[in-house]
Every structure is written in structure tokens, then in C-alpha cells.
Amino acid sequence: CKAMHVAQPAVVLASSRGIASFVCEYASPGKATEVRVTVLRQADSQVTEVCAATYMMGNELTFLDDSICTGTSSGNQVNLTIQGLRAMDTGLYICKVELMYPPPYYLGIGNGTQIYVIDPEPCPDSDF
């Protein structure tokens, strides 16, 4: 088992439509063919899984399990997009990368991206 460096941006601001995108980049020490990417959210002391995907290198990244995430992969980079975010979803989003196959197994955990979500102001009533 080996450790692996994972880089991700420190801060991202979600769009007014509740969409946040960031890149998760890992320093792959070997030629992995199967990679698992998990996005975790830490708020207070609670850690919850946001979404996860296992993909074969060179293939499309597919998030299953009715995911709020989409993504694409290019080499050792994963471009992640989280949708449907609201102000209450503000928190630290950690990118976890596992090189599943072939052995040896590698695990890397990023320092997290603080995603800020601001709910849009409702449109004021108008007499016009």
C-alpha cells in the first residue's frame, strides 16, 4: 500500500444555479488501469459521501447511484462538477483517489476544496 499526492483547489464559489466545478489531480506513481474517485463532504465533525465513480483509464467517468456529480477524466486529472447545491451545502469537499488495479494499491486524499454556496435572492414582486 502506498500514499499518493492529490491536489485540489482551496476554494470554489458555486454559481447562482448551485453548480460548482473543480479539478482533482493525482500524482500517479504507476500505470493504473482502474481508478476510483470519491468526493466526501466534511461539515463540523461529520464526513459524508457525496458521490463516487470507478473508471477504467481512457474511458468516460461515470457516477452511478443517482449522483449529483458529473465528471470527465484526462490523464491524471479528474474534472468534477457538483450540481444542485444550496447554501446549506457549503462545506469542505475532499477528493479521494484510489488506484485499484493493478497492484499495488495507492490511496490519495486531497486537502479539500471549500465550496461556498449562496442561495440566489428571490425576485422581488413587481407592479410593472
Epitope: 500500500c1 502506498k2 466526501l40 459521501e49 452511478l64 490511496l107
Partner: antibody
Framework: EVQLVESGGGLVQPGGSLRLSCAAS????????MSWVRQAPGKGLEWVAT????????SYPDSVKGRFTISRDNSKNTLYLQMNSLRAEDTAMYYC???????????????WGQGTLVTVSA | DIQMTQSPSFLSASVGDRVTITCRAG??????LAWYQQKPGKAPKLLIY???TLAEGVPSRFSGSGSGTEFTLTISSLQPEDFATYYC?????????FGGGTKLEIK
């Protein structure tokens, strides 16, 4: 209160099949990764299978790969283990377990059911 | 597979004693180690995860330490309800293997 109740164990002949169930309550079942762990009589613990929250990802050790299938029905809050081509060495108490993330961002078997006994014998 | 070796396999002690159980991993597992307690006829119970973090509701007399390949579980002052079998398990990669167990008996 988290509750996991296994059922479906029993006596089966070598080469036979069995389907175990685990009824979950006291938490939002669809939000958690779930696993099966077994323990042969008088022996230690062995991880058997894991399934992701929505069932899209499964994992098995080599000892059961190709013979056992883990699945879940989130609408029924139930976890399953389909066991085929059973062997004498599969005789064990089978526990279902809920996995939680700790501060290290890795899963732990946080809650366990009381188990259901599977005996494979002629 | 990463082999997990526990020692001793059996341990006799008295109420009030301080006991230490050791778990060795076949390769570096960093701090990805859990300890479980199992009483006869019961399911295992999570005691410690991440090598040293106490699970919810676990008494403070239990503590874990170590990283890399060497880990210990310490019970500072044994209580009657602590006599059980203890297992370590790594959670780093797959398969997630357990140690063989340490049976803690009353002297």
C-alpha cells in the same frame, strides 16, 4: 437507534445456494455503504462483500468472487447476499454491517447485526 | 493481501490491570486501522478507528496508538465487562483483513 437484522441462514448442501437478507432501520439506508462479514465457528472475522449506497459499485475478496453477489433494495431498506456454489468452508455466521466514514475519510464497520448462521454440509 | 498479526492470542488478566494488545500489519497501512470487541455469541463492536479515535460511546479506558505497521490497543484499568475477544482490522485497500484475535480472559 441503528438496527440491522439478518435472516435467511440455514443448512444447505455443498454446491447449493442460499440468499441472506439484512433488514435495516433507524437510519437513512440509502445514504450508507453496506457490507457482509463472516465468522467461521471458533474462528476469526473475514470481510465478504461491500456495496455502495446506490448499488452501483460492489467489491469481493477472491475467496467468494464469482460465487457470491451482494445487492440492495433501498426502497425496502434491505441488503442481500446471494450465495451460490456453496462449499463446506463457507460455513459461518454472516453479519451485515453499516460502514461509516471516520476523520481519515476511510470507511469503518460502525454497526453490526447479530448475524445469521449458514451451515454447508452433506 | 495485507496480513494482520495479533499478539498475544490469549491473555489472562485481573480486574484493574492495564493490558496491551499488539497488531502488526504486513506492510505500511498508515493509520488506517480499527479495533473491535466481540463477546461470546454477540456481534463485534467498533472500539477504535483511524488507529486512535474512540468510537461513539466507548469508555475512555480504551486507547489506541501506532501507525505504519505497529499498533497497540490499551485498556488502562480492566473492568469485568472488558473480558472478550479483540480484533484489529486494516481499512486500507482491498481486501480489508482482520487479525486473528486476542482472547482476554479472567485470571
Amino acid at each position: 437507534e441503528v438496527q440491522l437484522v439478518e435472516s435467511g441462514g440455514g443448512l444447505v448442501q455443498p454446491g447449493g445456494s442460499l440468499r441472506l437478507s439484512c433488514a435495516a432501520s433507524g437510519f437513512t439506508f440509502s445514504s450508507y455503504t453496506m457490507s457482509w462479514v463472516r465468522q467461521a465457528p471458533g474462528k476469526g472475522l473475514e470481510w465478504v462483500a461491500t456495496i455502495s449506497r446506490g448499488g452501483g459499485y460492489t467489491s469481493y475478496p477472491d475467496s467468494v468472487k464469482g460465487r457470491f453477489t451482494i445487492s440492495r433494495d433501498n426502497s425496502k431498506n434491505t441488503l442481500y447476499l446471494q450465495m451460490n456454489s456453496l462449499r463446506a468452508e463457507d460455513t459461518a455466521m454472516y453479519y451485515c454491517a453499516r460502514e461509516d466514514y471516520g476523520s481519515s475519510y476511510v470507511h469503518w464497520f460502525a454497526y453490526w447485526g447479530q448475524g445469521t448462521l449458514v451451515t454447508v454440509s452433506a | 493481501d495485507i496480513q494482520m498479526t495479533q499478539s498475544p492470542s490469549f491473555l489472562s488478566a485481573s480486574v484493574g490491570d492495564r493490558v496491551t494488545i499488539t497488531c502488526r500489519a504486513g506492510e505500511n497501512i498508515y493509520s488506517y486501522l480499527a479495533w473491535y470487541q466481540q463477546k461470546p455469541g454477540k456481534a463485534p463492536k467498533l472500539l477504535i478507528y483511524n488507529a486512535r479515535t474512540l468510537a461513539e460511546g466507548v469508555p475512555s479506558r480504551f486507547s489506541g496508538s501506532g501507525s505504519g505497521t505497529e499498533f497497540t490497543l490499551t485498556i488502562s484499568s480492566l473492568q469485568p465487562e472488558d473480558f472478550a475477544t479483540y480484533y484489529c482490522q486494516h481499512h486500507y485497500g482491498s481486501p480489508r483483513t482482520f487479525g486473528g484475535g486476542t482472547k482476554l480472559e479472567i485470571k
